[in-house]
């Protein structure tokens, strides 16, 4: 699928509802095209299939183009963890959009990752916290359940749940995001 | 109130040994990378490691690899910083820092820990 | 590593007037099309306080006159206004990637 990026305004961003983070700015601080990959080097593509789009974790051959995803960065509030209602400093909340008016949402009750058309403002489950990691990796954590991650579950991607204190090295929810 | 407070600095000769701590509080210890920083007397600051949450990954500066090893105690929400075969370059005041939620920059401070190496 | 230089090394001004610091990088600070330069004041006897982050968002409680811009390797930090408690050491840092490094910093100081 080609990821027609042309006129693709992300010019409003989210409302907070009442969740345990809230976006800053209703603009992106920044926006960059890039591919995404799994920590194995496997493509993550999306396909339209039946009027509605398909996201894959594969192989690429050699000679076939990556899938680009519009990366949108919001500047957001992390909220302090002893009072609740307090702010403890600043985080990076992206949203993933591989083409025109459909965003990669969180299915909290499926655990799963699904494409869907959206208007703005768009909706929580659309914002990831946006995690740094080692070996040039980065992580995405649900914006609507703390600790859950997209991750890659049996050549698709999925929700995973993670324990902080022990496995926020798993390799299953390490992506690698390449601007060539 | 997220606070760190640093202890265990002091007077070491040259090739001692030296263990730095970090008590950390006001917030979820465990979900955060944490870093120490080093400023020499009158100088710069100088990155010296850190510890990622979930105590996968640690990275250090190359002047200390070897000698100076970063470790953390999540059920007691303390950072460590141990240094062995100290050197008189080695003086500085060393902050501990926590990086901000999501693992970008260094967010919070704490007010730092005097060594001073010297015969 | 990522060398940082910062300009100029002593900046004399009077407080209202507009600083501007200077911070270029060796290479490009970019990442994950994120500019990964941040900007952190530091006064006698205290730790650095973050100012700005990803090159241009402000910290937690910094007031709106410290402002940071620039991309790839030029970065720009400008305090609108210099109030008295501003005069300070200002220090630029990359965080693209290990060592994280940081400019040798540049004195606003009282005229």
């Known amino acids: 699928m080609g990821s027609s990026h042309h006129h693709h305004h992300h010019s409003s961003g989210l409302v907070p509802r009442g969740s345990h983070m809230s976006i800053t700015g209703i603009s992106p601080i920044t926006e960059s095209l890039a591919s995404l990959s799994t920590y194995n080097d496997q493509s993550i593509t999306f396909a339209l299939e039946d009027e509605s789009y398909e996201i894959y974790v594969e192989d690429l051959k050699k000679d076939k183009k990556k899938d680009k995803v519009l990366l949108s960065y919001y500047e957001s509030q992390h909220p302090s963890s002893e009072s609740g209602d307090g702010v403890d400093g600043k985080m990076l909340m992206v949203t993933l959009s591989p083409t025109k008016d459909f965003w990669l949402q969180a299915n909290n009750k499926e655990h799963s990752v699904e494409l869907h058309k959206c208007e703005k403002p768009l909706p929580d489950q659309a914002f990831f916290v946006l995690h740094n990691r080692s070996f040039n990796c980065v992580s995405f954590e649900c914006k609507t359940d703390p600790g859950v991650f997209i991750g890659v579950k049996d050549n698709h991607l999925a929700l995973i749940k993670v324990d902080y204190s022990e496995n926020l090295g798993s390799e299953n929810i390490l992506f690698k995001l390449s601007e060539t | 109130e997220v606070q760190l407070v640093e202890s265990g600095g002091g007077l070491v000769q040259p090739g001692g040994s030296l263990r730095l701590s970090c008590a950390a509080s006001g917030f979820t210890f465990s979900s955060f990378s944490m870093s120490w920083v080093r400023q020499a007397p009158g100088k710069g600051l100088e990155w010296v490691a850190t510890i990622s949450g979930g105590k996968t990954f640690t990275d250090y500066v190359d002047s200390v690899k070897g000698r100076f090893t970063i470790s953390r105690d999540d059920s007691k929400n303390t950072l460590y910083l141990q240094m062995n075969s100290l050197r008189a370059e080695d003086t500085a005041v060393y902050y501990c820092?926590?990086?901000?939620?999501?693992?970008?920059?260094?967010?919070?401070w704490g007010q730092g820990t005097l060594v001073t190496v010297s015969s | 590593e990522i060398v940082l230089t910062q300009s100029p090394a002593t900046l004399s001004l009077s407080p209202g007037e507009r600083a501007t610091l200077s911070c270029r990088a060796s290479e490009s600070v970019a990442k994950y099309g994120l500019s990964l330069l941040n900007w952190f004041q530091q006064k006698p006897g205290q730790p650095p306080r973050l100012l700005i982050f990803?090159?241009?968002n402000r910290g937690s409680g910094i007031p709106a006159r410290f402002s940071g811009s620039g991309s790839g390797t030029d970065f720009t930090l400008t305090i609108s206004s210099l109030e008295p408690e501003d005069f300070a050491v200002y220090y630029c840092?990359?965080?693209?990637?290990?060592?994280?490094?940081f400019g040798q910093g540049t004195k606003v100081e009282i005229k």
């Open positions: 990803a090159a241009s």
């Open positions: 820092t926590r990086a901000n939620y999501g693992n970008w920059f260094f967010e919070v």
């Open positions: 840092q990359q965080s693209k990637e290990v060592p994280f490094t």
